[in-house]
């Protein structure tokens, strides 16, 4: 049994880091493998993550963490029984993938303005809470070419757009994702999408 693709890990900078790797053949990850992880810190203990299958030869492990600070570094040991398959380390602050925003809501009752709001996925005491910026994706269900991205570079989890910038009388969907420049993170996953029917009053033409 050998590791074909070494584990790569990302942290949500809160409570979970996710490590993925590939074996050289079909593997029952949960019964055959264990990923041991230990914070490099005085008197810390090793903890065990039981991996799950992620495709035939792929494995994924969700490492529970109490919290994360920038100085943290973990040792990782991948075991198959008594055999050490791979040894590495992981610094969560250098491999951050933020949590996806939630509760995306489209408010259509504000005159001819669409107000999109969502929730910051972090609690106020987490460092990322005040460092997230967002991308909002809006697309038409009827027209695949009608697809747009709005970059929200301010901290407030909301976006206002004129309803007239979208076509009237058709359905649109929106989703949002987050990233944090301070840790040069990757983008989060997209939030679940939300749907609304776009309708607004056309202004009377002046002759």
């Amino acid at each position: 049994m050998k590791v074909l693709q070494e584990p790569t890990c990302v942290s949500d900078y809160m409570s979970i880091s996710t490590c993925e790797w590939k074996m050289n053949g079909p593997t029952n990850c949960s019964t055959e493998l264990r990923l041991l992880y230990q914070l490099v810190f005085l008197l810390s203990e090793a903890h065990t993550c039981i991996p799950e299958n992620n495709g035939g030869a792929g494995c994924v492990c969700h490492l529970l963490m109490d919290d994360v600070v920038s100085a943290d570094n973990y040792t990782l040991d991948l075991w198959a029984g008594q055999q050490l398959l791979w040894k590495g380390s992981f610094k969560p602050s250098e491999h951050v993938k933020p949590r996806a925003p939630g509760n995306l809501t489209v408010h259509t009752n504000v005159s001819d303005t669409l107000l999109l709001t969502w929730s910051n996925p972090y609690p106020p005491d987490n460092y990322l809470y005040n460092h997230l910026t967002y991308a909002v994706n809006i697309w038409s269900e009827n027209d695949p070419a009608d697809f747009r991205i709005y970059n929200v570079t301010y901290l407030e989890p909301s976006l206002r757009i004129a309803a007239s910038t979208l076509k009237s009388g058709i359905s649109y969907r929106a989703r949002v994702r987050a990233w944090a420049q301070c840790y040069n993170t990757t983008w989060s996953e997209w939030s679940p999408s939300t749907k609304w029917h776009n309708s607004y009053r056309e202004p009377f033409e002046q002759h």
Partner: antibody, heavy 125, light 112 residues
Framework: EVQLVESGGGLEQPGGSLRLSCAGS????????MTWVRQAPGKGLEWVSS????????YYADSVKGRFTISRDNSKNTLYLQMNSLRAEDTAVYYC??????????????????WGQGTTVTVSS | DIVMTQSPLSLPVTPGEPASISCTSS???????????VDWYLQKSGQSPQLLIY???NRATGVPDRFSGSGSGTDFTLKISRVEAEDVGFYYC?????????FGQGTKLEIK
């Protein structure tokens, strides 16, 4: 009441051995790292050794490395310090102390918040 | 090893007056925001040491509020706002960030 009680001290000749014990009560012993600190007559405090809650990780001062062994029996709520190849400079009062919560992913530290009464070790010919 | 240097080594104080002890470490003891791994202990004559302050500024359970700890990185201070007769003894700072734990030399506080 949270309590630590040391025993096992005494007079021993240079080159001899002693085993100190520290019995814990009033707290969940296995969840805490434990530490030994000593104090030579008229001197300050000197850290000797520490052990994690599971016993899987141990640390020693250079002055005792290779001669002293720290261990624990969580079923008996007891910490030990096996002292071999004793030297005159090991003469001191030995204290055990309750250290950080070490079973969490990140050890939780609240200082060495409980100390035993101390046991005296005298090494002399 | 991290060296902990205390000053003064002797501190005569009049009851009711404030007192201050300094401790300097040879390396930073700051691990993360607000977490400095330095403690303060008091050892009264013939007794075991007792914890006063942990993580630089957290008062241990049962410690009177006249004791306070401050500082970050390499420079730390223990302050007693109004010294009482029962405060006499040796005060030690200790770092617990890395092995080996190291103590300061001790400061002897005595009543004038």
């Amino acid at each position: 009441e949270v309590q630590l009680v040391e025993s096992g001290g005494g007079l021993e000749q240079p080159g001899g051995s002693l085993r100190l014990s520290c019995a814990g009560s009033g707290f969940t012993f296995r969840t805490y790292a434990m530490t030994w600190v000593r104090q030579a007559p008229g001197k300050g405090l000197e850290w000797v050794s520490s052990i994690s809650g599971s016993g899987g990780n141990t640390y020693y001062a250079d002055s005792v490395k290779g001669r002293f062994t720290i261990s624990r029996d969580n079923s008996k709520n007891t910490l030990y310090l096996q002292m071999n190849s004793l030297r005159a400079e090991d003469t001191a009062v030995y204290y055990c102390a309750k250290d950080r919560v070490s079973i969490t992913i990140r050890p939780r530290y609240y200082g060495l918040d409980v100390w035993g009464q101390g046991t005296t070790v005298t090494v002399s010919s | 090893d991290i060296v902990m240097t205390q000053s003064p080594l002797s501190l005569p104080v009049t009851p009711g007056e404030p007192a201050s002890i300094s401790c300097t470490s040879s390396q930073s003891l700051l691990y993360s925001i607000g977490k400095n791994y330095v403690d303060w202990y008091l050892q009264k004559s013939g007794q075991s040491p007792q914890l006063l302050i942990y993580e630089g500024n957290n008062r241990a359970t049962g410690v009177p509020d006249r004791f306070s700890g401050s500082g970050s990185g390499t420079d730390f201070t223990l302050k007693i706002s109004r010294v009482e007769a029962e405060d006499v003894g040796f005060y030690y700072c200790m770092q617990s960030l890395t092995s080996p734990y190291t103590f300061g030399q001790g400061t002897k506080l005595e009543i004038k």
